[in-house]
Interface confidence: medium
């Protein structure tokens, strides 16, 4: 069947990196500069992606594969194949329409990208706050207040113990 198909369609013999040139009796012609074909039997070559502006070339275009871009320092990739670059912010910030803004009280972001997320509510799991949250870090939940009461099970209370939600002075 493959033999028959290739007799019927000479273009099927054209390998990746070439195209079937209708202007030249369907000869397999190499892809022109700055273009590629990643599969055989193609009638045209695709234009290579250009990594310009905020984009850097991670992988050069070849006759058989497209260029790949990543982002210049201070930016990170978004979207399939790094179709967009988004500005980094500092930890403890999020990107808004007005640029990088500090996380509101009660929220944190431990990365250079993404949004500020609320601190964990320890009490929902019956636990207490062991370490207070900051703009950059979530709270750390510890044993429940009951576990810290005298005569409770063998959980060793943290030293020094302090009221949930309050920083040591």
């Amino acid at each position: 069947f493959e033999r028959t198909r290739s007799l019927q369609d000479p273009c099927s013999n054209c390998p990746a990196g070439t195209f079937c040139d209708n202007n030249r009796n369907q000869i397999c012609s190499p892809c022109p500069p700055n273009s590629f074909s990643s599969a055989g039997g193609q009638r045209t070559c695709d234009i290579c992606r250009q990594c310009k502006g905020v984009f850097r070339t991670r992988k050069e275009c070849s006759s058989t594969s497209n260029a790949e871009c990543d982002c210049t320092p201070g930016f990170h990739c978004l979207g399939a194949g790094c179709s967009m670059c988004e500005q980094d912010c500092k930890q403890g910030q999020e990107l808004t329409k007005k640029g990088c803004k500090d996380c509101c009280f009660g929220t944190f972001n431990d990365q250079k990208r993404g949004i500020c997320r609320p601190w964990t509510n320890c009490s929902l799991d019956g636990k207490s706050v062991l370490v207070n949250g900051t703009k950059e870090r979530d709270v750390v939940c510890g044993p429940s207040p009951a576990d810290l009461s005298p005569g409770a099970s063998s959980v060793t209370p943290p030293a020094p113990a302090r009221e949930p939600g309050h920083s040591p002075q």
């Epitope: 992606r49 250009q50 990594c51 310009k52 502006g53 905020v54 984009f55 871009c69 978004l78 790094c82 179709s83 967009m84 670059c85 988004e86 500005q87 990107l95 808004t96 329409k97 007005k98 640029g99």
Partner: nanobody, 122 residues
Framework: EVQLVESGGGLVKPGGSLRLSCTAS????????MSWFRQAPGKGLEWVSH????????DYADSVKGRFTISRDNAKNSLYLQMNSLRADDTAVYYC???????????????WGQGTLVTVSS
């Protein structure tokens, strides 16, 4: 096809001024935030400023705050950067960029101009 064309660059003495322009075509200019970026010789790309679609929200990098002013004329599909009190470290290729409509702060890879060179030297 989206096109962004910068102009207005050139050689200027320290303390001097320049006004960069960016003319946009191929998209509805009024729908998009727009940004200026710059790239100094041998350095990475640096965000300079951006402006919201209506021009009401504006932000600047600390390095240019108080010296540069971004503006836009939606009737002319144009973005501007007025640069005053120029210093040697402002020397760079300046690019305008269209920010992604879904999340300002992002830039789609084909939505960049080719840049205009600003050289600040005595």
């Amino acid at each position: 096809e989206v096109q962004l064309v910068e102009s207005g660059g050139g050689l200027v003495k320290p303390g001097g001024s320049l006004r960069l322009s960016c003319t946009a075509s191929g998209f509805t200019f009024t729908d998009y935030y727009m940004s200026w970026f710059r790239q100094a010789p041998g350095k990475g790309l640096e965000w300079v400023s951006h402006i919201s679609s209506s021009g009401t929200t504006i932000d600047y990098a600390d390095s240019v705050k108080g010296r540069f002013t971004i503006s836009r004329d939606n009737a002319k599909n144009s973005l501007y950067l007025q640069m005053n009190s120029l210093r040697a470290d402002d020397t760079a290729v300046y690019y305008c960029a269209r920010e992604d409509i879904r999340m300002p702060g992002t830039t789609d890879f084909d939505n960049w101009g080719q840049g205009t060179l600003v050289t600040v030297s005595s």
